[in-house]
């Protein structure tokens, strides 16, 4: 199996960004997807049986979706860093993807708006 991610992305301070991973090249069934921040704190979990769980510390700024992705809102400079998606699958086990997010001051971000949500 292979995890495809949005890779290195940048977004404007105060804006929003979508973190997206996609698992391909496997017959495995996805049972859960975990989203983690650079300091290994869990942002959210999407479980096949239980649905979405957004961790309390991020409830105000994290929205589930689209799909198995995650939307980060009201971005601050402290949000810069690595984000990881972990796909738990049966029977293959786990697959992990990495995304690097750089939050830019508004003036710089005009040149890097590719993954930004208007």
């Amino acid at each position: 199996g292979t995890i495809e991610t949005t890779g290195n992305i940048s977004a404007k301070k105060g804006g929003s960004v979508i973190l997206q991973c996609h698992l391909s090249s496997t017959m495995a069934q996805v049972t859960q997807v975990n989203w983690e921040q650079h300091d290994h704190s869990l942002l959210a979990i999407r479980n096949a049986e239980l649905g979405w769980h957004i961790y309390p510390a991020f409830k105000d700024r994290v929205a589930p979706g689209p799909g198995l992705g995650l939307t980060l809102q009201s971005l601050t400079m402290n949000d810069t860093g690595e984000y990881f998606c972990t796909y738990h699958t049966y029977p293959d086990g786990t697959y992990r993807g990495r995304i690097f997010l750089e939050v830019l001051e508004s003036s710089v971000a005009e040149h890097s708006a590719r993954f930004q949500i208007p």
Epitope: M27, Q29, V30, T31, N47, E49, G67, Y90, P91, D92
Partner: antibody, heavy 121, light 108 residues
């Protein structure tokens, strides 16, 4: 207690249509991937179709002999899976089983008792 | 599609005898995706072994499974009367998923 109950089988003429239903209970249906498997003396056990969970985009897949004729669907709110069968042929006859599979640290695999479809004029 | 060939098609074994059923695949099957089912007349198939070697809940320890690639087997260390049934291998390593033709195991 886990239960899968199929219904909708019967006698149908070649070229006709039939819809099979399967109602599940005793496990978390929304987390299960569901299949239809059929069995006949001529062909043995034959996988027909599957529908995966929402996390897996409710992806559907079909056996070669039923592609374009059969459609699998599910309604998680009713813990049910369906198989719409169109343009039926004699070789579609057999016992149709509903199968549910679930992994939550342990793997579970459940089958219904089956419903019989006879395609004949 | 992957064709699963089971042998023998029919066999009989005495109580206490060691039994080996084989499943040969026309192309490689990932071991996590190879299952065995037991079926008795008038009943639906029951999961017996999954992921090549893991016994399903309630399956006696005299059963075991092994194999890799294109060759898999189910072994009963000492045959008992309740083991008389048909056994089917099944793969979901690639589409379309397929079943073997089965081995009917009878008690001598």
């Amino acid at each position: 207690e886990v239960k899968l109950e199929e219904s909708g089988g019967g006698l149908v003429q070649p070229g006709g249509s039939m819809k099979l239903s399967c109602v599940a209970s005793g496990f978390t249906f929304s987390g299960a991937w569901m299949d239809w498997v059929r069995q006949s003396p001529e062909k043995g056990l034959e996988w027909v179709a599957e529908i995966r969970t929402k996390v897996n985009n409710h992806a559907t897949n079909y056996g070669e002999s039923v592609k374009g004729r059969f459609t699998i669907s599910r309604d998680d709110s009713k813990s049910s899976v369906y198989l719409q069968m169109n343009n039926l042929r004699a070789e579609d006859s057999g016992i149709y089983y509903c199968r549910g599979a679930l992994y939550d640290g342990f793997y579970f695999d459940y089958w219904g008792q089956g419903t019989t479809l006879t395609v004949s004029s | 599609q992957i064709v699963l060939t089971q042998s023998p098609a029919i066999m009989s074994a005495s109580p206490g005898e060691k039994v080996n059923l084989t499943c040969s695949a026309s192309s490689s099957v990932s071991s996590g995706y190879l299952y065995w089912y037991q079926q008795k007349p008038g009943s639906s198939p029951k999961l017996w072994i999954y992921g090549t070697s893991t016994l399903a809940s309630g399956v006696p320890a005299r059963f075991s499974g092994s194999g890799s690639g294109t060759s898999y087997s189910l072994t009963i260390s000492n045959m008992e009367a309740e083991d008389a049934a048909s056994y089917f291998c099944h793969q979901w390593s690639s589409f379309p998923y397929t079943f073997g033709g089965g081995t009917k195991l009878e008690m001598k």
